[in-house]
């Protein structure tokens, strides 16, 4: 039979009976929850008939009394079998056993779910000696129960290497539903279905779930936990939560925001980190990612010169590290630069355009049509050339550098001359007769010295030779010319 005790106005007496300190009688539930102490009486079940020691684990003593009568088997008296109470309430339960006085050093230990309870637990053992037996009452109390206190509690006593085990006392802590799985924030594609999960447990069970979207109940009738909500798609951000209900009341999950993935906002603060003649290093601050990670970015570059054809160069790069070196640009040119980035939904608009300029560079080509001839009367070598095309000067010409190398039997010396930017001719003194003079010319800007022209060689004869002719830069691909006079 199951005996029940529900809340009453007066507390249950603890251990009324013959022993001082209140030893229980067999028919009294082993639970005292006096209202004055802040405890609420709880629901209890006693699984065995009152008055009978349990038949579980008993020790039959081998010792006999003076009259040689065998001692009765030792066993814990039956106790309340099931205590149901609310979270944060207090509870006290106990085991009792009568032990013949011939046994010494009897100790009772408490165990929960197969593990011994040591240390900080509030367990008290009281002894009530009589002529032949000692009543031992072991009490266990919890001042404010939590869910973790749920479980099966037993007492153990060792006598003569025999272990006596009490019936279990099941503690069931009931409270509001407790979430084991709550909905998670998500970023979703517009108008695409997705799932949210909510799970809560008691006791008491069952736990029923209601879903709430933007303060409106999605399901008007409860669903048993766990519950999966299929949201049929969203067109704008929404907040979801779930309510878990049981007989104790209602717990509401955290509200989670579900965002709609969108194209990113345009990058901001595009800035020039460094400029060279042919490259510009830019950085940018990414815009809002539209709830979807950036995949890559596109740098758009157009010449700012109003006379340019307006074509746009596009450079693709990874989204990180928000830095890109734009190459293959013209020197001393103005450019408009914009940045756009994309996520899985699409491309952002282009950032505000910024103006950037490349610096002067060294010319990219050498002077053209270099010719060299000997002016014997003045003992000079005359050099003429054409300046490189303006586009390839990569800056403002400040002049030219002439390299002339004189070679005769076993001797070689190189000399360098600087020439102002206005001319396209130069005269150098003959350094050695009966020698070959090799001439190369490079254009110079503030950005540096450009490449030298292909070498032009002229033979300078010993004094008194009359015949001579100019030497000039060869057509591309021909071998270096040598003029023999």
């Amino acid at each position: 039979a199951i005996t029940e005790a529900r809340e009453e106005a007066k507390p249950y007496p603890l251990f009324p009976g013959p022993f001082p300190g209140s030893l229980q009688t067999d028919h009294t539930p082993l639970l005292s929850l006096p209202h004055a102490s802040g405890y609420q009486p709880a629901l209890m079940f006693s699984p065995t008939q009152p008055g009978r020691p349990h038949t579980g684990n008993v020790a039959i003593p081998q010792v006999t009394s003076v009259e040689s009568k065998p001692l009765p088997p030792l066993a814990f008296k039956h106790t309340v079998g099931h205590i149901i109470l609310s979270e944060h309430k207090g509870v006290k339960f106990n085991c009792s056993i009568s032990v013949p006085n011939i046994y010494q050093d009897t100790t009772i230990s408490w165990w929960k779910d197969g593990k011994e309870l040591l240390g900080a637990h509030h367990a008290i053992t009281q002894f009530y000696p009589d002529d032949e037996v000692t009543a031992i009452i072991a009490s266990f109390s919890i001042t404010s129960v939590q869910r973790s206190d749920n479980g099966s509690y037993i007492c153990k006593m060792k006598i003569n290497n025999e272990e006596i085990v009490s019936d279990p006392i099941y503690i069931e802590v009931q409270g509001l539903p407790h979430f084991t799985k709550q909905p998670e924030s998500m970023n979703v594609t517009r108008n695409t279905a997705f799932n949210l999960t909510c799970q809560a447990v008691g006791p008491p069970e069952p736990v029923n779930i209601f879903w709430v979207q933007n303060s409106s109940r999605v399901n008007e009738q409860p669903e048993k936990s766990p519950s999966v909500l299929t949201v049929p798609g969203l067109t704008e951000m929404a907040v979801f939560s779930c309510e878990a209900h049981n007989d104790k009341g209602l717990t509401v999950s955290k509200g989670v925001q579900i965002n709609i993935k969108a194209i990113p906002s345009p990058p901001t603060e595009v800035s020039i980190r460094n400029s060279t003649a042919h490259s510009i290093l830019i950085s940018w601050v990414p815009g809002f990612d539209g709830y979807s990670p950036f995949r890559n970015c596109s740098i758009q570059v157009k010449e700012a010169d109003p006379l340019s054809n307006g074509s746009v160069m596009i450079f693709n790069t990874s989204a990180l590290p928000h830095l890109y070196q734009i190459k293959q640009l013209q020197a001393l040119a103005n450019y408009s630069i914009g940045v756009s980035c994309m996520n899985e939904i699409g491309w952002s608009a282009v950032s505000p355009w910024i103006l950037a300029s490349t610096t002067e560079g060294a010319p990219s080509v050498a002077p053209l049509n270099v010719t060299v001839f000997l002016n014997e009367s003045s003992d000079n070598v005359d050099i003429r050339w054409m300046k490189p095309p303006t586009k390839q000067q990569d800056g403002e010409l400040v002049g030219y550098r002439i390299s002339h190398v004189w070679q005769s039997a076993g001797i070689s010396k190189e000399l360098l001359e600087e020439v102002g930017q206005n001319g396209s001719r130069a005269r150098i003194s003959v350094q050695v007769h009966n020698a070959t003079c090799t001439v190369r010319i490079a254009a110079v800007t503030r950005g540096g010295v450009g490449p030298f022209s292909d070498p032009v060689k002229i033979f300078i004869p010993a004094h008194g030779w009359v015949d001579y002719a100019p030497s000039s830069t060869p057509a591309p691909g021909n071998a270096d010319p040598v003029l023999i006079i």
């Epitope: 933007n214 409106s216 008007e220 009738q221």
Partner: antibody, heavy 118, light 106 residues
Framework: QIQLVQSGSELKKPGASVKVSCKAS????????MNWVRQAPGQGLEWMGW????????TYADDFKGRFVFSLDTSVSTAYLQISSLKAEDTAVYYC???????????WGQGTLVTVSS | EIVLTQSPDFQSVTPKEKVTITCRAS?????MHWYQQKPDQSPKLLIK???NLASGVPSRFSGSGSGTDFTLTINSLEAEDAATYYC?????????FGQGTKLEIK
């Protein structure tokens, strides 16, 4: 398959009462709320309210508070609509319909015509 | 309560034509459902939650919209589509229906 079968047409005099039934089959009756929708002759659809088949709690739209009562007999998976003190303007087809998430009416009864005429 | 206004009230169209019915809510709603009702029949769910086709509904029907403006589109109308169409909102109690749009086939 899911079916909602309603009771037959009724002809009533003003002041009388009528009780329309809606028997559900093909699903667990207590899992989904039961709604009632009215359609007067030649008119559109009007949501009257619903009854929670799990708790038995009814909810009435403002225009249907008072003379209209929703009830259940879960043992036979049936919902009822009772209208008392009938008036001529109660003449309409009354539909029962189930909904789940997001209150779309996936299943409808065939409708019950209630005619109130002296 | 949220008032739903459908337009047009009535439309006469020829087969294969594209038809658009709009439903405007007096304030923002989360979802719009659409129903088709033929004479002497119960309403039938066509579109649930704004844009999701109910089972067994031909793909020529589609729904779209958000906030206060929603649309039911029938691409390439067929003779069997002659019916009255109703929108119904979810998001604010009480649930409300539009007044209906009657579609006649020429």
């Amino acid at each position: 398959q899911i079916q909602l079968v309603q009771s037959g047409s009724e002809l009533k005099k003003p002041g009388a009462s009528v009780k329309v039934s809606c028997k559900a089959s093909g699903y667990t009756f207590t899992n989904y709320g039961m709604n009632w929708v009215r359609q007067a002759p030649g008119q559109g659809l009007e949501w009257m309210g619903w009854i929670n088949t799990y708790t038995g709690e009814p909810t009435y739209a403002d225009d249907f508070k008072g003379r209209f009562v929703f009830s259940l007999d879960t043992s036979v998976s049936t919902a009822y609509l009772q209208i008392s003190s009938l008036k001529a303007e109660d003449t309409a087809v009354y539909y029962c319909a189930t909904y789940g998430h997001y209150a779309w009416f996936a299943y409808w009864g065939q409708g019950t015509l209630v005619t109130v005429s002296s | 309560e949220i008032v739903l206004t459908q337009s047009p009230d009535f439309q006469s169209v020829t087969p294969k034509e594209k038809v658009t019915i709009t439903c405007r809510a007096s304030s923002s709603v989360s979802y719009m459902h659409w129903y088709q009702q033929k004479p002497d029949q119960s309403p039938k769910l066509l579109i649930k939650a704004t844009s999701n086709l109910a089972s067994g509904v031909p793909s020529r029907f589609s729904g779209s919209g958000s906030g206060t403006d929603f649309t039911l589109t029938i691409n390439s109308l067929e003779a069997e589509d002659a019916a009255t169409y109703y929108c119904q909102q979810w998001g604010t109690k009480p649930l409300t229906f539009g007044q209906g749009t009657k579609l006649e086939i020429k």
